[in-house]
């Protein structure tokens, strides 16, 4: 049997119902409607999509974002929702489909010709003109790899981890998301026990680097559950 094992930075997702795949009702999927593994008869058809549970946008597909399915719904229940097309309402960039970004609550095209000025204006609007930096982090930097070709450096505004340079991930910082360093061995990490707990973090940590996982520090085993310290440790 095959088991999904999410890394320490993600919630432990329940797999979709047997014989089906996860996704969205009514979503048009351009790829062939099935999964085919060469060398065998493991073919199954995907017709009815089921919502996929998530804690953050990075756990969803590139044409999705992570949110509560109902307006003002339970923050602990989040699923991957189909991205919003141009001229649809939005609250953040990740809600808009690739090639678009969120400006003044509406998804607009990230057309290269007039994009740079608009995005800088949007970032300034979001954070106010008074403070151009937050804890020394510059605000007017790469927003998305779909928009700029250079990868975001540490402190750059981002949508997802693929927007950031190697060794960095995209994590929440106040009400924005910026590129932060992936955690090294021995650094404190966050182990999420509850679904949706990502949404409560104002200062989100990156996940542990390659070959590391977030585990309880050995000398903290005796401590109470709430005070247990997790660190990045070798597998």
């Amino acid at each position: 049997t095959l088991n999904s094992v999410l890394n320490s930075n993600a919630i432990k997702n329940l797999p979709p119902p047997l014989g089906g795949a996860a996704g969205h009702p009514g979503s048009a999927v351009s790829a062939a409607p099935g999964i085919l593994y060469p060398g065998g008869n493991k073919y199954q058809t995907i017709d009815n999509y089921q919502p996929y549970p998530c804690a953050e946008d990075e756990e969803c597909g590139t044409d999705e974002y992570c949110a509560s399915p109902t307006r003002g719904g339970d923050a602990g229940v989040q699923i991957c929702l189909a991205c919003r097309k141009r001229r649809k309402r939005c609250m953040r960039h990740a809600m808009c489909c690739p090639g678009n970004y969120c400006k003044n609550g509406i998804c607009v095209s990230s057309d290269q010709n007039h994009f740079r000025g608009e995005i800088e204006e949007t970032i300034t609007e979001s954070f106010g003109n008074d403070h151009s930096t937050l804890d020394g982090y510059s605000r007017r930097t790469t927003l998305s790899s779909k928009m700029y070709h250079t990868k975001g450096q540490e402190g750059s505004v981002c949508l997802r981890s693929s927007d950031c340079a190697s060794g960095l991930c995209c994590a929440r910082h106040f009400w924005s998301k910026i590129c932060k360093p992936v955690l090294k061995e021995g650094q404190v990490c966050t182990k999420h026990r509850r679904k949706g707990s990502h949404g409560l973090e104002i200062f989100q940590r990156c996940y542990c680097g390659e070959g590391l996982s977030c585990r309880i520090q050995k000398d903290h085993h005796q401590a109470s559950n709430s005070s247990r310290l997790h660190t990045c440790q070798r597998h």
Epitope: Y37, I46, Y49, E58, T62, S162
Partner: nanobody, 125 residues
Framework: EVQLVESGGGLVQAGGSLRLSCTAS????????VGWFRQAPGKERDFVTA????????AYADSVKGRFTISRDNAKNTAYLQMNSLKPEDTAVYFC??????????????????WGQGTQVTVSS
């Protein structure tokens, strides 16, 4: 179109380690799911592990859980398979594969559209 090239295979003793790389060229690698599969002589090609476009989700076959680790570096257009505590039964040709990651689903259920040529891993006892 995505072209995939595997490297890092070879002969290793039981208990040893190997690190396979899967380097992509062509279409935007950072928006694809990447999977590793293996095929032993006379057997079916089996799922080993997979990672979603961002690296936030991974999945492993039970037989490799705790020994193998998948990761990716989108800036380098490369995915990695770190294989530790290798056993003779891990001997196989290892293939990497990629597919569009537009809609999230269980990582064992993706349609892998592009495949590499494979790299031989032999574990001797």
């Amino acid at each position: 179109e995505v072209q995939l090239v595997e490297s890092g295979g070879g002969l290793v003793q039981a208990g040893g380690s190997l690190r396979l790389s899967c380097t992509a060229s062509g279409s935007a690698f950072s928006s694809h799911v990447v999977g590793w599969f293996r095929q032993a002589p006379g057997k079916e090609r089996d799922f080993v592990t997979a990672i979603n476009w961002s690296g936030a989700r991974t999945a492993y076959a039970d037989s490799v859980k705790g020994r193998f680790t998948i990761s990716r570096d989108n800036a380098k257009n490369t995915a990695y398979l770190q294989m530790n505590s290798l056993k003779p039964e891990d001997t196989a040709v290892y293939f990497c594969a990629a597919g569009r990651d537009r809609y999230a689903r269980d990582l064992t259920e993706y349609e892998y559209l592009w495949w590499g040529q494979g790299t031989q891993v032999t574990v001797s006892s």
